[in-house]
């Protein structure tokens, strides 16, 4: 089956959610781990990640179509310390499949705002930190 990983972001007030979505077939979930790394160009692994999610096969899902699993990492207030390059990755302990998402970046600016760049699906986000609005 075709397995792929996408990265996205959303904002709720001051919170920034970084989302790693893995698309896979139901039977491929077992043994899969999804993880998010920061500033790790070569050694992104579950052990060095900020957060990881181990997928489980859900017997409650019928059919053999493609399903998605999401890892969400929430930053309550983005600070200059969050600036850097992030990457969503996944790997299967059963099949040895390894997925690497596109790199995306958080840049905290001198004005106290921040931008998230490099996301696919037209997701270039620019956030005003104080107002918590999408500009």
């Amino acid at each position: 089956g075709c397995i792929n990983i996408t990265s996205s972001a959303s904002q709720e007030g001051t919170r920034l959610n970084l989302i790693c979505t893995v698309w896979h077939k139901k039977e491929e979930a077992e043994g899969f781990v999804v993880f998010l790394c920061k500033d790790r160009s070569g050694d992104c692994s579950p052990e060095t990640s900020l957060k990881q999610l181990r997928l489980k096969r859900d017997p409650g899902i019928d059919g053999v179509g493609e399903i998605s699993s999401q890892l969400m990492f929430t930053i309550s207030q983005v600070t200059p310390l969050h600036s850097g390059t992030y990457q969503c990755c996944a790997r299967s302990q059963k099949s040895g499949i390894r997925l690497q998402g596109h790199f995306f970046s958080i840049l905290f600016t001198e004005t106290g705002n921040y931008t998230v760049t490099g996301l696919k699906q037209r997701q270039h986000l620019e956030f005003s930190h104080n107002e918590g609005t999408l500009s």
Partner: antibody
Amino acid sequence: EVQLVESGGGFVQPGRSLKLSCAASGFTFSNYAMAWVRQAPTKGLEWVASINSGGGDSYYRDSVKGRFTISRDNAKNTQYLQMDSLRSEDTATYYCATHNYGSTIFDYWGQGAMVTVSS
Amino acid sequence: EIILTQSPTTMTASPGEKVTITCRASSSVSYMHWYQQKPGASPKPWIYETSKLASGVPDRFSGSGSGTSYSLTINNMEAEDAATYYCQQWNYPSMYTFGAGTKLELK
């Protein structure tokens, strides 16, 4: 178990230098931004400096800018605070602390290193 | 720079009493964090993001507030709660600021 152990504190004359170290264990040190927070005797807490996970960016409170330098060695799981041109008002217990990644709270603290600046 | 003003500076409370400590910010802030510190010990995270209890904190503690006014409440004071409590916030560009502390003593 997360452990932060400070060392290097002591008695120093005004204008002199001192370097504090903080040895970290029990977590992936290179993932976390780190900080120094100080507490003058019988006084409150005061943030001093922070450094990002890779060590490339650092931030300071105004009163220590140009005198203090925060740094880290991820291979040694250690962060440092180089304190130059020390003043009597720098007398305090200096705590090493970790930044919680998802929040703006300092979640783990060392036991503190006492720095006394006096002639 | 945002200034955090805690009140009262010192207070005493009897076991079982309800205790409220307040922290006022000179400008609006998004979240407030609280720490507990006992003599000779390091500060411990106590309440984060205004109302979430840190690991191991008894549920007699609660936090609330928004904008410039925040509070920490103990519903039934116990002897082990005697300590100094500090509020803390993050704001750009002043970064991290703490209140001066509230010393809570057992009556």
